[in-house]
């Protein structure tokens, strides 16, 4: 063991930015830091056989297996692949040590498989395996949180059904409103199942794996609070279970509190009662109403009452399937080039969708909003004053639901021409779209304003990348115009922009762009 | 180079949560199949295996201890953490965090160790 | 779950001794068995992986042997920095079991 080199394997994750295929090379790209892969001898192998833990990544992902050997002297090597051998590049690092790398860019599932490395060194020879397979996410879920009663204890446990295994936390906060955001000082996050301080304002639990983090919120009535304007709703789907939570605090503890479905008292076993004083020594009672499995037959309005307060209720909605519900309708806005402006979509859903929004075929973060009506809304905002068509996609388990926008920006005309032997083009994108006038340049005219009403074709068409409409006009060549300069105007709402051609030759002569306001 | 460091409480009282975190660097429980274990060591006694939890969220327990044992990794993949509820004074013990590593069709059980953290269950 | 048996529970020698430790398990483990070296107030280090490889780093004069329900640790001439205690681990089947441990001191 002593007369063997010492290897150390490494991975390196790259931050994709390239697309090729699995190549040797002797200087990676920048990159992150190495990961160390345990590089061992393989037992009971004949030979002296090296292997690295198992590699496992996602489609597309950019990686770099190296090698670096610690042996004295020049060492040769080379690259086996599905018996295909790839050249090698060794090189030296500034501790003397053998550097031997494959770059594998945007990983595909060809690109899976068995790398060898073969290394000979002045003292002896070796072999170096390497297992790169993709990581399977198909089967990887995020299932949101649902809540279950602890055996024999007043307490939550929170469970998400997902692969790989998420990390659950419960998400608190005392506050109203606002104060109680996601990164607020007023949030509290206890990362486990169980949850036994159930007394709190707002209560979350959330699940988080490699997919994403999603959240279920528990439903509360809370009597000292003034009703929202219109009932709150809460959805589920046949098979979920039922949560709600009515709070009330009051200056003693004589006042009790109790759940009616359709005023109807619900069942023992529907029901848990916690009580506790609370630091200014008021009594807060919290009423729990659950069912573990909901059926359509619990659908109704749930009414929490108290002794010494208001009544408030909930509607329960239970339906088969889920839903998004908005109106898909286009949209088009005119907006002013420095108008502060955002498109939104308002919509009522379950489950909570995950949503993006598209322009120019690049996705965007989509973040949605709760309002008091039960509906929830979604922004977009940073369109960066681009004209063109916005899509927003959402989608949960059971529907789809698309809409488009297109935005149009107000700004003057920008001229573009290009001439050919037979006839000139104009174009221009601003908006409105602009109309368009042909003048000849001749010793009669020649501050060109002899008007061409000949051979002149006007269309506007849609540039595809943008969805953004582009007017042009086009002038067939007569022997009345050629050899002239020619000047195309834009002209909308805003200004005219011109450009000057000259119709002597095949190629393109654009002239002095004019801009006249 | 290859670091496993465990951090928690020092002293816990009989029956409540001990909670144990391992912070690793120099490897990661995301691209390759690597595990972090968690094993411990009464003083004076031998080691005993507790619990694993390799890169793709597999799972393993210690029969005896599984229905009081979690283990989770952080999605940063940088952390693993052991709860252990209900502890009692025989939980006391050095609580130690190791790497596994996987391959093709082979395991190289604890190649890395962390230093270590001494966890007292005493009221 | 599998039992580890280490023997003998300690033992004392002397610099340059052949020191001999063996474990056996209470059912075939293959060559699922690893061997560590643990010295006071110190994490164990991984000397013997799948019964007879050498880890990266540990000296030669470590070896292990054996298969099935036998496994030995041989030091074929005891250092001073050696002195510890050894324990032998099986990953052949959950729960993984550690044996009790050998002592090894000076004579």
């Known amino acids: 063991n002593q007369d063997l080199p010492v290897i150390k394997c490494v991975l390196i994750n790259h931050k994709n930015n390239d697309s090729s295929v699995g190549k040797s090379s002797s200087y990676p790209m920048v990159s992150e830091s190495p990961e160390d892969l345990g590089c061992a001898l393989r037992p009971q192998s004949s030979g002296t056989v090296y292997e690295a833990a198992a590699v496992e990544v996602d489609v597309s992902a950019s990686i770099t297996l190296q090698v670096l050997v610690d042996a004295p002297g020049n060492i040769s090597c080379l690259w086996v692949f599905k018996h295909s051998s790839l050249n090698c590049q060794p090189h030296f690092d500034l501790q003397n040590r053998g550097v031997v790398s494959m770059v594998i860019l945007k990983m595909t599932e060809t690109q899976a498989g068995e790398y060898l490395l073969f290394i000979q060194s002045e003292a002896t020879n070796y072999t170096i395996l390497f297992t790169v397979s993709i990581r399977n996410t198909l089967l990887y879920t995020l299932r949101r949180p649902y809540f279950r009663k602890m055996e024999n204890q007043d307490a939550l446990v929170c469970i998400s059904e997902s692969v790989p295994e998420p990390i659950v936390e419960w998400v608190l906060c005392d506050s109203q409103g606002e104060s109680c955001k996601e990164e607020s000082p007023a949030v509290v996050k206890k990362e486990e199942k169980v949850l036994h301080e159930l007394f709190g304002t707002d209560i979350r639990c959330c699940a988080r794996n490699e997919l994403g983090r999603e959240c279920t919120r528990l439903f509360t009535i809370d009597l000292n609070q003034t009703p929202q304007t219109t009932l709150p709703q809460l959805f589920l789907k046949v098979g979920e279970p039922l949560w709600i939570r009515c709070k009330a605090v009051h200056v003693n503890h004589g006042f009790g509190l109790t759940w009616e479905l359709e005023n109807k008292a619900l069942e023992e076993g529907n029901y848990f009662e916690m009580s506790t004083y609370s630091t200014n020594r008021t009594m807060i009672r919290i009423l729990f109403a659950f069912v573990s499995s909901v059926a359509r037959n619990d659908t109704g309005y749930y009414t929490c009452s108290s002794s010494k307060h208001p009544s408030q209720s909930a509607l329960v909605t239970i339906v088969e399937k889920g839903f998004i519900n908005a109106t898909n309708s286009s949209e088009d806005y005119e907006i002013d080039q420095y108008e502060e402006f955002c498109f939104s979509v308002r919509f009522k859903a379950y489950p909570q969708i995950r949503c993006t929004w598209t322009f120019s075929r690049k996705s965007f973060p989509c973040e949605q909003k709760g309002l008091d009506n039960g509906y929830s809304i979604s922004k977009f905002c940073n369109h960066k004053h681009q004209p063109g068509e916005y899509i927003f996609h959402a989608e949960n388990d059971d529907a789809q639901f698309t809409k488009m926008f297109t935005l149009n920006i107000r700004r003057k005309p920008q001229v573009l021409a290009e001439a050919s032997a037979s006839q000139a083009s104009c174009f221009s994108d601003g908006y409105p779209l602009p109309s368009w006038t042909w003048k000849k340049c001749s010793d009669k005219s020649p501050n060109c304003t002899e008007e061409i009403t000949e051979g002149v074709w006007n269309r506007k068409a849609n540039r595809k990348v943008f969805g953004q409409w582009v007017s042009s006009s086009t002038l067939n060549m007569s022997e009345a115009i050629k050899g002239f300069l020619v000047k195309c105007c834009a002209y909308n709402s805003l200004g005219t922009s011109c450009e000057t051609i000259l119709l002597n030759s095949p190629g393109p002569f654009p002239f002095i762009q004019d801009n006249i306001s | 180079q290859v670091t496993l460091k465990e951090s928690g409480p020092a002293l816990v009282k009989p029956t409540e949560t001990l909670t144990l975190t391992c912070t690793v660097s120099?490897?990661?429980?995301?691209?390759?199949?690597?595990?972090v274990s968690w094993i411990r060591q009464p003083p004076g006694k031998a080691l005993e295996w507790l619990a694993h939890?390799?890169?793709?969220?597999?799972?393993s327990y210690s029969t005896s201890l599984k229905s009081r044992l979690t283990i989770s990794k952080d999605t940063s993949k940088t952390q693993v953490v052991l709860t252990m509820t209900n502890t009692d004074p025989v939980d006391t013990a050095t609580y130690f965090c190791?790497?596994?590593?996987?391959?093709?069709?082979?395991?190289?059980?604890?190649?890395?160790w962390g230093q270590g953290i001494m966890v007292t269950v005493s009221s | 779950d599998i039992q580890m048996t280490q023997s003998p529970s300690s033992l004392s020698a002397s610099v340059g001794d052949r020191v001999t430790i063996t474990c056996r398990a209470s059912?075939?483990?293959?060559?699922?068995l690893n061997w560590y070296q643990q010295k006071p107030g110190k994490a164990p280090k991984l000397l013997i992986y799948?019964?007879?490889s050498l880890q990266s780093g540990v000296p030669s004069r470590f070896s292990g042997s054996g298969s099935g329900t036998d496994f030995t640790l041989t030091i074929s001439s005891l250092q001073p920095e050696d002195f510890a205690t050894y324990y032998c681990?099986?990953?052949?089947?959950?729960?993984?079991?550690f044996g009790q441990g050998t002592k090894v001191d000076i004579k």
């Open positions: 681990l099986q990953h052949n089947s959950y729960p993984w079991t």
């Open positions: 939890i390799f890169s793709n969220g597999e799972k």
């Open positions: 120099g490897f990661s429980l995301s691209n390759a199949r690597m595990a």
């Open positions: 190791a790497r596994i590593v996987g391959y093709s069709d082979w395991l190289l059980p604890f190649d890395h």
């Open positions: 799948a019964a007879s």
């Open positions: 059912q075939n483990i293959n060559r699922f």
